[in-house]
Amino acid sequence: QPSVSPGEPSPPSIHPGKSDLIVRVGDEIRLLCTDPGFVKWTFEILDETNENKQNEWITEKAEATNTGKYTCTNKHGLSNSIYVFVRDPAKLFLVDRSLYGKEDNDTLVRCPLTDPEVTNYSLKGCQGKPLPKDLRFIPDPKAGIMIKSVKRAYHRLCLHCSVDQEGKSVLSEKFILKVRPAFKAVPVVSVSKASYLLREGEEFTVTCTIKDVSSSVYSTWKRENSQTKLQEKYNSWHHGDFNYERQATLTISSARVNDSGVFMCYANNTFGSANVTTTLEVVDKGFINIFPMINTTVFVNDGENVDLIVEYEAFPKPEHQQWIYMNRTFTDKWEDYPKSENESNIRYVSELHLTRLKGTEGGTYTFLVSNSDVNAAIAFNVYVN
C-alpha cells in the first residue's frame, strides 16, 4: 500500500493485496476492504456496474460474469482496486457486441477475457474470411482488443475475438464494425438556380444540394446581412456507405419586393465549410424594356437591304411579338429568339429583315411586344432615297 503522511487521508486497503486475482469458476471470491471511512465496493465490467455497502465482498460461487474490476472507496473519495478473473473454460470471453469506430481513430472490440493466461488473443474474420492485411490491434485482457487507426475500408467488417485453448482456436460471438467516416474535404454544395426573378405574390422556392461522407454535415440557408431564421425543408439519401446527399429547400410562399436579396446555402463539417448563393429579385409587376440595336431613324438607298434589330427584356415571358408597317403585320421576314438558352434568361432579340427597299416602302416600322402584365413598342423611321 502507498505510504502517506500522518493526518493525510489514505486510500483503502484491499485483501488480497494484489492488483489481479485469478479464481476458478465455482470457487469463492472474498475481498476485504479495510478503511475506517469505508463507503462502498463497486464492481465494473463492460457497461455493468454493481455496488455493495458491506466492506467484505463475498461471491460464494464465482461465475465468469463476476470477472471485472472491484473498487473500494472511502469517505474521502479515495479508492483502491483489484481486478478479478474468473477462469471458466466454457466462457473465455465477456462480450459487448456494439462496435463503432471513427475513421483514423482507435476503437475497442469489447471482449475482455476471463483468463489472462490464454495465448494468441487476437481477431479473426467471420467464416474464415480474411481480415484486412493492414489491421493492427493492441490486446488488453481486461478491456478487449483495440483496433488501431480504423480505416474506412473496415466498414461492415465481421470479426471475432479469438484465443487458443488446448491447441484449438476458440471464437467469441461475432462483431460487426461500423465505421463513422472522418471528413477529409469540405462539403460539396450546389444550388438549383443561381438567380430568380419573381413578381410579388409568387412563390420563391430554391433547393440546395449538399453532398458529404456522412449525415453529420451541417447545413443551413442564410439571407445575407440578416440573422432571421429561414424556413427550410429537408430530404436526404444515403447512396451507399459514405455518399450522403441532403436537399435543403427554402420556400417563401408569397414573395414581396423586400424579400429581394442574396440567399446563401452554407454547409460545414470538421474539415471546413463551403457555400453557394442565389439571388432573388422580386418586382411589383412584370415589365418590358426595349433597346434598339440601331438608330431608330434609318436612311437607306433605293434597292438596298436593312435589318431593324431590337433587344428587349421581358418578364414574365413575352407572349405576343409583331412588326407592323402601315397597320399591316409582317407574317414573315422577321425572327424573334431568346438571347441565351439559360432558363433564367429574360433578354430577347427581334430582327426584321427588309430587302431591296423601294422608295415607296419608307415610313414607320413598329415593333410591338406584350406579356401578361404590360405592352411595349418601339418605332423605326425609315427613309428611302
Epitope: T119, N120, Y121, S122, L123, L131, P132, K133, L135, R136, F137, I138, P139, D140, P141, K142, M146, K148, S149
Partner: nanobody, 126 residues
Framework: EVQLVESGGGLVQAGGSLRLSCAAS????????MGWFRQAPGKEREFVAA????????YYADSVKGRFTISRDNAKNTVYLQMNSLKPEDTAVYYC???????????????????WGQGTQVTVSS
C-alpha cells in the same frame, strides 16, 4: 529508429534448453509488439512467438506451443524466448522483430514487422 540486438544462441543437445534475449534500443510504447521468427537454410522465415508490450499477451506458433515461452522485461526493454525440449528441427537462425503500430492481424506474417535484428544461430544436435 529502433535497433534490436539478439543474444543467447548456440549449440545444444536435443532435449536441452536455451534462452534467447532481444534488447531494443529506442522508445517502446503501448502499441509495441515484439516477436521471434526463425529461418532454417533453404526455408522461408517462420513465426515462432510474439508478445504485446502493454499487456504482455503472448502469441505462439503451433510447433513451439508448450515448449517455448516468450516474456518481456519492460524496464530493460528486452524480450526473452525460453526454449525447452529443443528438437533438431528447431535448428535455425532466430531473428527478433518489432513493430510500433500494434500487433498485426496476421502476427505470423514476417512482412508486417518494421524492425529486425541481425539474428542469432541456434543449432540443436541429435
Amino acid at each position: 529508429e529502433v535497433q534490436l540486438v539478439e543474444s543467447g544462441g548456440g549449440l545444444v543437445q536435443a532435449g536441452g534448453s536455451l534462452r534467447l534475449s532481444c534488447a531494443a534500443s529506442g522508445r517502446t510504447s503501448g502499441s509495441y509488439v515484439m516477436g521471434w521468427f526463425r529461418q532454417a537454410p533453404g526455408k522461408e522465415r517462420e513465426f515462432v512467438a510474439a508478445i504485446s508490450w502493454s499487456a504482455g499477451m503472448t502469441y505462439y506458433a503451433d510447433s513451439v506451443k508448450g515448449r517455448f515461452t516468450i516474456s518481456r522485461d519492460n524496464a530493460k526493454n528486452t524480450v526473452y524466448l525460453q526454449m525447452n525440449s529443443l528438437k533438431p528441427e528447431d535448428t535455425a537462425v532466430y531473428y527478433c522483430a518489432a513493430d510500433q503500430r500494434g500487433v498485426p492481424a496476421y502476427y505470423s506474417d514476417y512482412a508486417l514487422y518494421d524492425y529486425w535484428g541481425q539474428g542469432t544461430q541456434v543449432t540443436v544436435s541429435s
